[in-house]
Amino acid sequence: IWELKKDVYVVELDWYPDAPGEMVVLTCDTPEEDGITWTLDQSSEVLGSGKTLTIQVKEFGDAGQYTCHKGGEVLSHSLLLLHKKEDGIWSTDILKDQKEPKNKTFLRCEAKNYSGRFTCWWLTTISTDLTFSVKSSRGSSDPQGVTCGAATLSAERVRGDNKEYEYSVECQEDSACPAAEESLPIEVMVDAVHKLKYENYTSSFFIRDIIKPDPPKNLQLKPLKNSRQVEVSWEYPDTWSTPHSYFSLTFCVQVQGKSKREKKDRVFTDKTSATVICRKNASISVRAQDRYYSSSWSEWASVPCS
Amino acid sequence: RNLPVATPDPGMFPCLHHSQNLLRAVSNMLQKARQTLEFYPCTSEEIDHEDITKDKTSTVEACLPLELTKNESCLNSRETSFITNGSCLASRKTSFMMALCLSSIYEDLKMYQVEFKTMNAKLLMDPKRQIFLDQNMLAVIDELMQALNFNSETVPQKSSLEEPDFYKTKIKLCILLHAFRIRAVTIDRVMSYLNAS
């Protein structure tokens, strides 16, 4: 058993039929010695008396809020949560496996630049009685500070018969240098509690590996004189690290005909313009990627030819 | 403003072309190592990230773009003295910091070159003949060092009398290649920045 936060405890259980469970001793936080009784949750049934209560925790029915009283007055609470271990593996029932970039990916994180700021998100089908708490650090043995905000519900989607909820959190490394060469990864730890079930999820990454720039901005077309060609130009996104001559991007330019079946024409370029033959109903799209370290491409910025 | 493309123009910063070739060569070599050594811990998640230049050179600090020198997190108190000549210095106006920066890059390359050559000598003795260092990568390191053209003492190639442990050597190769790729990215960023300045 260990303390998650004040008056909240996690009991780690090997979860299999007829498992012996875990013996837990609860102590009432009071100077009183006599006349103390214990109850569980909303029940008025007295479970025991005395300053301590010994219980055998085997299943979710044994978890919950234990309260000690004296003469109708509440003295203290202890909330017991269960953390299940099945076949030596901690349960992952609360969050959905996103399977990207590999199986058992429950947390996904992205950064728009090298400032040390990043966003992580996760998915669940659970809509109520759900809380998350997020901690992060750079390295684990001698951790350096990363500050995370509160996790918030950021999107709801319908997937078949199920609703899916996306939660996200923003974190910022306390003293980040955009030009630094990372040697210790960022660690992100999410505690998830659903009713009386506790689970924890972790992710470890270097900022350089989770970079995904915003799409190029100000994508514009300028017709060229006496020609069916146009000059396409765009700019670095505002959120990208500066100076741009140090944090350079490379771009993918794509021309797509009106029919999706039509083959796309595309090139890579380091420049922020290109000349394009713009046919009716075609569209021009541009996306960006770090020029020197190949992490994710941005989403496309698009403009119609008409 | 747009950066010029890789092919060097007359008067273009001469080392940009070489640094782009370096990044390409080390990335290819790392990819090859990860494929060939697929049953060894060779991915970024599996290896320990070591920097053989730590406390010997200070490339990130010495080559910091001016715009980032206001960022306290980027400023390290580490001071290293460097030689200050070199043919990548395009004009006499070249600042002292730029000279420090380029000589720090040169020292990095020299240290990695020695490590890679020592390692290659060991890998050539491996009866499995599983992996060797790409000669193109070694040549590109050499070309960039020549373009930087700093005079410094030659570091003797390390020779070891004991029987090499090929498993450890291959893991060390992965660690070195990951670290060198990260340094090659920094070098490329620096050359691009200097070229645009």
Epitope: R266, F268, T269, V276, I277 | Q20, N21
Partner: nanobody, 125 residues
Framework: EVQLVESGGGSVQVGGFLRLSCVGS????????MGWFRQAPGKEREFVAA????????DYRDSVKGRFTISRDNARNTMYLQMNSLKPEDTAVYHC??????????????????WGQGTQVTVSS
């Protein structure tokens, strides 16, 4: 294996024009980016113009923009460079090149794996 052969070079006066052609054989080139690069005596080879596989996207060296036009005819496996208002500084050997679109930025020499021998262009005043 792709073979590239350039033609159309020659000597012209300042302000004159030339049309260079590059014919590919050995493989259909419509999946390849193609480009023109030039090398003047004692100088590095430099990018001139490049064009995408279907011919819809192109780019030019700043100094030739508005004077040169790159195009291609995939049915003939041929790429062209129309050079107008020629200047003495355009004097060089012009090489054509072809490379997979995914190989890298199409204005960069190293993104091209196949090269022609080159055709000489001389502009005299």
């Amino acid at each position: 294996e792709v073979q590239l052969v350039e033609s159309g070079g020659g000597s012209v006066q300042v302000g004159g024009f030339l049309r260079l052609s590059c014919v590919g054989s050995g493989r259909t080139l419509n999946m390849y980016n193609m480009g023109w690069f030039r090398q003047a005596p004692g100088k590095e080879r430099e990018f001139v113009a490049a064009i995408s596989g279907k011919g819809l996207i192109s780019d030019y060296r700043d100094s030739v923009k508005g004077r040169f036009t790159i195009s291609r005819d995939n049915a003939r496996n041929t790429m062209y460079l129309q050079m107008n208002s020629l200047k003495p500084e355009d004097t060089a050997v012009y090489h054509c090149a072809a490379g997979q679109w995914s190989a890298g930025p199409f204005t960069r020499e190293r993104s091209y794996e196949y090269w022609g021998q080159g055709t000489q262009v001389t502009v005299s005043s």
